[in-house]
Interface confidence: medium
């Protein structure tokens, strides 16, 4: 069955600065990933950024930067502006979708213990959309 | 197999106006492209407008300043607002979608017919 899996870094240089990194483990290829915060995509959660293999990437403030790190797996790198860190508490959501195999979604947030420029461990929670 | 519902055409005197909906009957992944186009009798299929999932909006020079595009709260449905219709605009409407984007692989509505009588 793929798997969706979601780790959300605070930077150890900048503490206003956040990166997420999500990943496909499974078959087939990545036609789409969709990321968003607050939620899981269409159900109360907002988008941050989507990545086309080949149309290229949109992103949303507060997202900075969007980019393929492999053929499987995308970072996102986030700017928080206000003071009080209100990534830190927040859930992201990665949707990656292989056409017309369906889509696979998980959720992942910054652990309260962790301490900036160490990666949350891979924790998904996988939302199966379809198959 | 996706399967594209049309609805909304009709017939309408010119200078009205009428908007057309389409809903993608397939949900389980998100449609990157999806759009109008239009055949009038004893024409080629046309392109009239597309939107893409991020929202990037292409409407064609004939239409721009009175039809509008856009994609529904619920994924993969698509509207098209018409407004300002002329005699000209009469024609088969079909929605399209491209999952890839990239027209690998598109789909077709049946088609609704639009009438604009003068």
């Known amino acids: 069955t793929p798997e969706v899996w979601v780790q959300v870094q605070m930077e150890a240089t900048e503490l206003s600065s956040f990166t997420v990194h999500c990943g496909f483990l499974g078959p087939g290829s990545i036609s789409l990933v969709t990321v968003s915060w607050g939620g899981p995509d269409g159900a109360g959660g907002t988008k941050l950024a989507v990545l086309h293999p080949e149309l290229g990437t949109r992103q949303w403030a507060p997202a900075r930067q969007a980019r393929w790190e492999t053929q499987s797996s995308i970072s996102l790198a986030l700017e928080d502006s206000g003071a009080s860190s209100p990534f830190a508490n927040t859930t992201f959501c990665c949707k990656f979708a292989s056409f017309p195999e369906g889509s696979w979604e998980s959720c992942g947030s910054l652990p309260p213990s962790s301490d900036p420029g160490l990666s949350a461990p891979p924790t998904p929670v996988p939302i199966l959309r379809a198959d | 197999q996706v399967q594209l519902v049309e609805s909304g055409g009709g017939l309408v005197q010119a200078g009205g106006s009428l908007r057309l909906s389409c809903a993608a009957s397939?949900?389980?992944?998100?449609?990157?492209?999806m759009g109008w186009y239009r055949q009038a009798p004893g024409k080629d299929r046309e392109l009239v407008a597309t939107?893409?999932?991020?929202?990037?909006?292409k409407i064609v020079d004939s239409v721009k300043d009175r039809f509008t595009i856009s994609r529904g709260d619920a994924k993969n449905t698509v509207s098209l607002q018409m407004s300002s219709l002329k005699p000209e605009d009469t024609a088969v409407y079909f929605c399209?979608?491209?999952?890839?984007?990239?027209?690998?692989?598109?789909?077709w509505g049946q088609g609704t017919q639009v009438t604009v009588s003068s």
């Open positions: 399209n979608a491209d999952p890839s984007g990239l027209g690998r692989k598109v789909y």
């Open positions: 397939e949900t389980y992944f998100d449609l990157y492209v």
């Open positions: 939107i893409t999932y991020t929202g990037s909006i």
